[in-house]
């Protein structure tokens, strides 16, 4: 493909001096948002060039010299970002008495062979030809850094261009990053992040917990020392050049922290209205155990789910859990402290406490003299109990007489699917107190208000019952 | 932290054989262990827990045919009287939580959650 | 004793695909969730992906999906992938009894 001479054949500008028409040396695609390469010369301006040149011999005519053979000077600097496609030239004339002239490419002193996109194009006139090769790398990559030169061999010798330095720019790359620890909690530590360039400087943002650290950059490469910490965070630094940032992985400071949750709980007895427990303390998280909470809730679908938490020290691992109702089934589960914080609470276990005495007295007590059999007649409802104890197994009734000078107690017990009971008249002419109480296998509970009835003397009756009210009459 | 079986080989009917699991990175006083075998081609069959406190339950089946005991760092299971059956990898295996009943004399297993990689023992004659 | 019972076995699905596997107790489990799942690979120890029917263990992948209460539990796995081919065990233990029973095993077979 033949291409517009993008330059003069002969020598134009001084050599070592940036001209304009040296950019169009460098074709690079204009996409959105690109910026030009830079480049610049290997010389300084003014001086005066004494690269490698070949004197060619007199001509046939033997009266005139032919100049100097040289590559002229091109862009010596090209900058560019990774991924970018480049293309950069050398250019020569070369007096048409030569034949047979090739170009070829050396990167930092090896010869490019093989599949490179190495074009050379031929512009002949009358008395030179231009020679122009091109050199093109598609999506540069760091690796593609370096200085290249043409080379040209003309009756054995050697011409060497200026060297083109291509410098791949792209975003940092860490040589360093920070690594996960473990430290003590408030202990001072040191985090290392480098990463380096092209394009140099490159500054170091750190980053704790997703937030900046240091509001100013530091260069890299930056050591942060955390003066301590109180819980775990993530680290990571950022590394800023003019290409744009890298963010470096996160790592995880792990620090002594809040327990782990007992490995073990153990129920050792029960009773109606406690549980002794023990437990095994997990992992400390390095920081000794201050104190413990077991945590108590009932398991019944008509409990409001409240939980009730007891607070014990640390040592001994063992509590009594009190305040319990009886013939109950709780979920426990066990926590521990220490400096930092509570631990996740156990695994919730299950325990009953035992059965226990009924807490409540039976209802509507009714008591009244049967004259004829000589007795008294008692009457109650079952005990209204929100919980019941234990199994119901009877009823005891305490019957009190008394009259002048005399009191004496008798007890009496009945069957649990009794709701009466007579008791034979004890004394005439004294007053009768009845008191009735229900028994679980628990034990008995509390008796109700005393009912008082008087016993005549034989041949008086009077069939007026006495009674407890019932609840909220009275 | 980690866990590894040890001791299992060929042996003949009836000679007892001791397999052993050493921890690390964690305390036997702190956690509650237990073994488990796997017969050749079969599923998991649990063999027995040792609680941090050294108290010992086993699965009814194994009750009698097996012993489990503990140092401050290993474990041990000794095969009584082994059987051409009792061919199996025995796997030890950390307990994450244990429940213990004293009063009744039993416990239940939360967790297995650190495995060994077992230990094959051949019975044979 | 109690006995968990395991279906189906074998089980398979697509890469991507989803798979469910039940798990049935005789009895209701200790407190109706102590029980756990285990996945074994050929050649390897098992190894814990859910306890308290539904809570992952650490490291588990969210398309490991446990639930269920008392006596019924279930394991899905949803997106499928080939790592997933393994035999799947559930496990759990009751009140009033120290045994520790396992399922049968079910194996998943990732196509």
């Known amino acids: 493909r033949e291409e517009a001479k993008p330059y003069p054949l002969f020598p134009g500008p001084l050599p070592g001096s940036l001209q304009t028409d040296h950019t169009s040396l460098l074709s690079l695609p204009h996409t959105s948002g690109y910026q030009p390469a830079l480049m610049f010369s290997p010389t300084q301006p003014g001086r005066p060039y004494t690269g490698n040149v070949a004197i060619p011999r007199v001509t046939s005519a033997g009266s005139k010299l032919l100049p100097p053979l040289a590559f002229k000077h091109t862009v010596g600097h090209i900058i560019l970002s990774e991924h970018k496609d480049v293309k950069f030239n050398c250019s020569i004339s070369v007096p048409n008495i030569y034949q047979d002239t090739t170009i070829s490419w050396w990167k930092d002193g090896k010869e490019l062979l093989g599949a490179h996109h190495a074009i050379t194009q031929f512009y002949p006139d009358d008395e030179v030809t231009a020679i122009i090769a091109s050199f093109s790398i598609t999506s540069v990559q760091r690796s593609d850094n370096g200085s290249y030169i043409c080379k040209m061999k003309i009756n054995n010798e050697e011409i060497v261009s200026d060297p083109i330095y291509i410098e791949v720019q792209g975003l940092p790359h860490f040589t360093k990053q920070p690594e996960s620890m473990n430290v003590t909690r408030n202990t001072a530590f040191n985090l290392t992040c480098q990463a380096v360039g092209p394009p140099e400087p490159v500054n170091i943002f750190w980053v704790q917990n997703s937030s900046r650290v240091n509001e100013q950059p530091e260069k890299s490469p930056s050591v942060l020392t955390v003066p301590g910490l109180t819980e775990m965070a993530v680290f990571s630094c950022e590394a800023h050049n003019d290409k744009g940032l890298t963010v470096s992985k996160g790592v995880q400071i792990n620090i002594k922290a809040i327990p782990s949750p007992p490995t073990e709980v153990s129920i050792h007895n029960s009773t109606a209205h406690s549980i002794l427990i023990s437990w095994v303390p997990g992992f400390d998280g390095y920081s000794p155990f201050r104190n413990c909470s077991v945590q108590v809730k009932e398991v019944d679908p008509l409990s409001n789910g409240s939980v009730m938490i007891f607070n014990t020290s640390a040592s001994p691992h063992m509590y009594q859990i009190k305040q319990l109702q009886a013939l109950a089934n709780y979920s426990i589960g066990v926590s521990c402290m220490n400096e930092i914080g509570w631990s996740a609470v156990s695994p919730w276990i299950l325990a009953s406490t035992t059965e226990g005495a009924p807490s409540v007295a039976p209802l509507n007590v009714t008591v009244f003299l049967n004259e004829s059999r000589d007795n008294v007649d008692i009457r109650w409802m079952k005990p209204l109990t929100k919980r019941q104890a234990g199994e119901l197994v009877g009823y005891r009734i305490s019957h009190v007489w008394q009259s002048a000078g005399i009191s004496k107690e008798l007890l009496e017990e009945v069957g649990q699917n009794n709701s009466r009971a007579q008791i034979s008249v004890q004394v005439h002419n004294a007053t009768c107190t009845v008191r009735i109480a229900a028994v679980t296998k628990g034990g008995v509970g509390p008796f109700s208000d005393p009912v008082k009835i008087f016993i005549p003397a034989h041949g008086w009756v009077d069939h007026a019952p006495s009674s407890t009210p019932a609840p909220g009459n009275a | 932290q980690s866990v590894e079986e040890s001791g299992g080989r060929l042996v003949t009917p009836g000679t007892p054989l001791t397999l052993t699991c050493t921890v690390s990175?964690?305390?036997?006083?702190?956690?509650?262990m237990s073994w488990v075998r796997q017969a050749p081609g079969k599923g998991l069959e649990w063999i027995g827990i040792?609680?941090?406190?050294?108290s010992t339950y086993s699965a009814s089946w194994a009750k009698g045919r097996f012993t489990i005991s503990k140092t401050s760092t290993t474990m041990d299971l000794k095969i009584t009287s082994p059987t051409t059956e009792d061919t199996a990898t025995y796997f030890c295996?950390?307990?994450?939580?244990?429940?213990?009943?004293?009063?009744?004399?039993?416990?239940?297993?939360?967790?297995?959650?650190?495995w060994g990689q077992g230990t094959l023992v051949t019975v044979s004659s | 004793a109690a006995v968990l019972t395991q279906t189906p076995s074998p089980v398979s699905a697509a890469v991507g695909g989803t798979v469910s596997i039940s798990c049935q107790s005789s009895k209701s489990i200790y407190n109706n969730n102590w029980l756990s799942w285990y996945q074994q690979k050929p050649g390897q120890p098992p190894k814990l992906l859910i306890y308290d029917a539904s809570d992952l263990a650490s490291g588990v992948p969210s398309r490991f999906e446990g639930s269920g209460s008392g006596t019924e539990f279930t394991l899905t796995i949803s997106d499928l992938e080939c790592d997933d081919a393994a035999t799947y065990y559930c496990a759990g233990g009751y009140s009033g009894d120290s045994d520790y029973a396992f399922g049968g095993g079910t194996e998943v077979v990732v196509k």
């Open positions: 295996a950390r307990v994450g939580f244990f429940v213990g009943y004293g009063a009744y004399d039993y416990g239940i297993i939360h967790r297995l959650d650190l």
């Open positions: 990175g964690f305390s036997l006083s702190s956690n509650a």
């Open positions: 040792i609680s941090s406190s050294g």
